[in-house]
């Protein structure tokens, strides 16, 4: 197996952050959700992962690594464009497909150096390598030379919650089974909380049986369900209290821009 490439963030331009909030410390906030997010670390000059509690916090918080880099690392976009143009494709694009040690069933994309295209593969849910992207678009942007770009694939992306697709540790499980929304669910504009609180309970793709809770936006209550251990969606909480805390207040008209308290 070929080795993974080192990250090259340290080569990206001068190290004065683009915005003052990029200098803020990571703030997980007072709530207890477990939302994988990213912040710019002034000491390491890199965007790093942290777990956000779901409410309050500060502006140094991003849903994706890419968004964090674009916002806080000077010159990042220029470098990213250079890579995407085929001038400098990252080394990890040439790593062979690695489904990883575990056996969840997660739809991912990798760059195939033989066909020079990004292709779908099944990722097991842990470990693996960095040639592993959550979306086709992300794979193309980073690894495919645009000259070779195939016509876009029409696929439903269930990624309400996108994480960095280039890292070994990326494990956000996007379920490729689309479950229709219940007609009883309130319209999105009536709900000011987290978007995943509107998703139906999804037991996932593995074989375990773990007690979890999901928010039912029709009843405004959190209910128990059996989670199989991988896959599923973010409407998945380890306790009823966490579930209510994260989702319940979304239906209340809220002056703080819909942030869950």
């Amino acid at each position: 197996l070929s080795e993974e490439a080192d990250d090259t963030d340290s080569e990206l331009g001068s190290m004065k952050p683009l915005h003052t909030f990029c200098a803020m410390k990571a703030d997980d906030g007072p709530c207890k959700a477990m939302i994988r997010s990213y912040f710019f670390n002034m000491y390491t000059h890199q965007c790093e992962e942290f777990i956000y509690g779901g409410c309050e916090g500060n502006e140094n918080r991003f849903d994706t690594l890419e968004e964090c880099k674009k916002t806080c690392i000077p010159g990042y976009e220029k470098t990213a464009v250079k890579a995407a143009s085929g001038a400098e494709r990252p080394d990890f694009c040439f790593l062979e497909e690695d489904p990883g040690l575990c056996r969840g069933y997660m739809k991912r994309y990798l760059y195939n150096n033989q066909t020079k295209q990004c292709e779908r593969f099944v990722y097991g849910g842990c470990l693996g390598n960095r040639n592993n992207f959550e979306t086709l678009d992300e794979c193309k942007k980073i690894c495919e030379n645009p000259v070779h770009s195939p016509s876009p694939v029409n696929e439903v992306q269930m990624s309400d919650y996108v994480t960095d697709g280039n890292t070994v540790t990326d494990r956000s499980t996007v379920n490729n089974i689309v479950v229709p929304q219940s007609p009883k669910v309130p319209r999105r504009r009536d709900y000011r909380g987290r978007p995943w609180c509107l998703q139906p309970a999804d037991s996932g793709l593995c074989k375990a049986s773990e007690r979890r809770f999901y928010y039912n936006s029709a009843t405004g209550k959190c209910h128990r369900f059996n989670y199989t251990g991988c896959g599923g969606n973010n409407n998945n909480f380890t306790t009823r209290r966490r579930c209510l805390r994260s989702c319940k207040t979304g239906l209340i008209k809220n002056k703080s821009k819909g942030v869950v308290k």
Partner: antibody, heavy 123, light 112 residues
Framework: QVQLQQSGPGLVKPSQTLSLTCAIS??????????WSWIRQSPGRGLEWLGI?????????RYAVSVKSRITINPDTSKNQFSLQLNSVTPEDTAVYYC?????????????WGQGTLVTVSS | DIVMTQSPLSLPVTPGEPASISCRSS???????????LNWYLQKPGQSPQLLIY???NRASGVPDRFSGSGSGTDFTLKISRVEAEDVGVYYC?????????FGQGTKVEIK
Amino acid sequence: QVQLQQSGPGLVKPSQTLSLTCAISGDSVSSNSAAWSWIRQSPGRGLEWLGIIYKRSKWYNRYAVSVKSRITINPDTSKNQFSLQLNSVTPEDTAVYYCARWHSDKMWGFDDWGQGTLVTVSS
Amino acid sequence: DIVMTQSPLSLPVTPGEPASISCRSSQSLVFSFGITYLNWYLQKPGQSPQLLIYKGSNRASGVPDRFSGSGSGTDFTLKISRVEAEDVGVYYCQQYDSYPLTFGQGTKVEIK
């Protein structure tokens, strides 16, 4: 019930090759729902993961950087076993060596371990 | 490499009393669905390690319900609700968030 039975010499001379074998019963080395690993334990280093192999559409292996240049883990499908080879050993490689199964389907952990083999590197 | 740090390193316990072991990782091991890429093992004297808790909080088969795992992000805890004499040994946490797989240095639990 999965059982892992280790075999191999307990004494190896410095600069030589340490070779251990782990025979599997109750599962297959080629199983899609398992991975096979070597881990060692010494008073100075605690539990140290050395490497792992697993079969999916093909065979994969991963090794710890600390031993990467010296280690090979190979499956033997005909005998349903896997082996560890560690080249150019030094007294620092003295440890109890364990083979272990990584459960890939439900538990995602090392759920079965061999009995351990104390390997001493000494002239 | 992700560094796993356990405390305390030695834990004298009284049978029937609760016990708690802490494990801290140098980077986050939790992903957004609440699955934790962390396991706990017990190595009884003279034996190989055995899996106790997988994915942070799930008991492996045959593990008594007095054992429980919890925690998120970088801080994890193994609790024994009522220690029994057979629980003595060294407890290890282990991460599988990224290679190399790494273990904590171990917590030795012994009867007072």
